[in-house]
């Protein structure tokens, strides 16, 4: 599926704006804040009551090539005794990010932006109970 | 940059790595089956480490609007619905890529930017430091 276009004409275009062919945009993939690091609490994926594992997906035609995805380890949550409590649910928390896809058409190469959904971790929730009449 | 496998029949001059600057189609492809109804949007209330969502808008960024999570409590909600301070609510953070207009206000010129967002919260056992 396609979503509406990025970019428009409402900006008072400064003279410094680079010329861009119609239907496309210029994208610098030198990342701003490339070296910032996540200061998340230590190994929360193991200490969580809804623990998760990480897997790395790798795609050479994607930038960045590595995308890390989380998977909840259990259906239920871990209780104080370290046992799985199936009266609660471990559920994935997801966030959207952008990637650049490189496409080969014969010997020519084109680039496409994509929205990708990343599972970031898991949280423990009270289940929604549907009462059947 | 990253190495790209090349069609062996293509001229050898092609760069195998991603170039620093690329021209990208204005349409953004949606790889998510975004309307997955299983993907609940009420976890923030039902979680044992509930969070509030704060709206952050920046017209120079794509996406312009990002909703960020802030944990409601230091502790976690127990079976009785009370806050249990023997456990900790902590944010789950993720680095995501967004587009930043560069130069500013230019309609069709962007640079990738990495930003850190808090997506939700999870309940963890605290790390206990024993003082000698």
């Amino acid at each position: 599926r396609k979503i509406p276009k990025v970019g428009h004409t409402f900006f008072q275009k400064p003279e410094s704006c680079p010329p861009v062919p119609g239907g496309s945009m210029k994208l610098d993939i030198g990342i701003i804040n490339e070296n910032q690091r996540v200061s998340m609490s230590r190994n929360i994926e193991s200490r969580s009551t809804s623990p998760w594992n990480y897997t790395v997906t790798w795609d050479p035609n994607r930038y960045p090539s590595e995308v890390v995805q989380a998977q909840c380890r259990n259906l239920g949550c871990i209780n104080a005794q370290g046992k799985e409590d199936i009266s609660m649910n471990s559920v994935p928390i997801q966030q959207e990010t952008l990637v650049v896809r490189r496409k080969h058409q014969g010997c020519s190469v084109s680039f496409q932006l994509e929205k990708v959904l990343v599972t970031v971790g898991c949280t423990c929730v009270t289940p929604v109970i549907h009462h059947v009449q | 940059g990253i190495t790209i496998p090349r069609n062996p029949g293509c001229p050898n001059s092609e760069d195998k790595n991603f170039p620093r600057t690329v021209m990208v189609n204005l349409n953004i492809h949606n790889r998510n089956t975004n309307t997955n109804p299983k993907r609940s949007s009420d976890y923030y209330n039902r979680s044992t480490s509930p969070w509030n969502l704060h709206r952050n808008e920046d017209p120079e960024r794509y996406p312009s609007v990002i909703w960020e999570a802030k944990c409601r409590h230091l502790g976690c909600i127990n079976a009785d619905g009370n806050v249990d301070y023997h456990m900790n609510s902590v944010p789950i953070q993720q680095e995501i890529l967004v587009l930043r207009r560069e130069p500013p206000h230019c309609p069709n010129s962007f640079r990738l930017e990495k930003i850190l967002v808090s997506v939700g919260c999870t309940c963890v056992t605290p790390i206990v430091h024993h003082v000698a």
Partner: antibody, heavy 121, light 106 residues
């Protein structure tokens, strides 16, 4: 084509609550926030608040915090606004409108037809 | 909150006449949005991000301004332009609307 179909007019008693609905069609529901606007002859157009169907996030104009509760159901592409503890001051026409999350300069581009609420004993 | 003051509150113009209405903000804002509303209908987005005409809006309409002073201009009034026009800001919470400028045809 894009449509925001709102529920019908309501005549309600003071002190009660009412829930208005706004069914979206013709676009990806979760790509847009739903904003709600009130219109009266005295106060004109007033922004009530916003609901993000994707995350469930809500943000309110302080004036309507506690008066309105905004929710959305992704499976039916429907947004809801509950108005509580109604008084005659809550009478007016209520509109839902969509707002593109990705490029905010488009603003509130499509509006529902409005729901008229009359609070009277 | 940012107060948007529209003037004139009511105006009338003959067909072919040039029309200008203004919107003054109590604090500086980034962009202004204009909505057209006719009796018994919902507001329609008319001009967005100060300058841009919404889809289907005739080219005789234009928007301009910056900071605290904005305007909507019709180069040559037509009967179908008779309506109330509201300005709107979303630079600061709570988002606010002007009181409206009612444009009538002579």
């Amino acid at each position: 084509q894009v449509q925001l179909q709102q529920s019908g007019a309501e005549l309600v008693r003071p002190g009660t609550s009412v829930t208005l609905s706004c069914k979206a069609s013709g676009y990806i529901f979760t790509d847009y926030e739903i904003h709600w606007v009130k219109q009266t002859p005295v106060h004109g157009l007033e922004w009530i608040g916003v609901n993000d169907p994707e995350s469930g996030g809500t943000f309110y104009n302080q004036k309507f915090d506690g008066k309105a509760e905004l929710t959305a159901d992704k499976s039916s592409s429907t947004a809801y606004m509950e108005l509580r503890s109604l008084t005659s001051e809550d009478s007016g026409v209520y509109y839902c409108t969509r707002y593109y999350r990705y490029e905010s300069f488009y603003g509130m581009d499509y509006w529902g037809q409005g729901t008229s609420i009359t609070v009277s004993s | 909150q940012i107060v948007l003051t529209q003037s004139p509150a009511i105006m009338s113009a003959s067909p072919g006449e040039k029309v200008t209405m203004t919107c003054s903000a109590s604090s500086s804002i980034s962009y202004i949005y204009w909505f057209q509303q006719k009796p018994g209908t919902s507001p329609k987005r008319w001009i967005y991000a100060t300058f841009e005409l919404a889809s289907g809006v005739p080219a005789r309409f234009s928007g301009s301004g910056s900071g605290t002073s904005y305007s909507l201009t019709i180069s040559s009034m037509e009967a179908e332009d008779a309506a109330t026009y509201y300005c709107h800001q979303r630079s600061s919470y709570p988002w606010t609307f002007g009181g409206g400028s009612k444009l009538e045809i002579k």
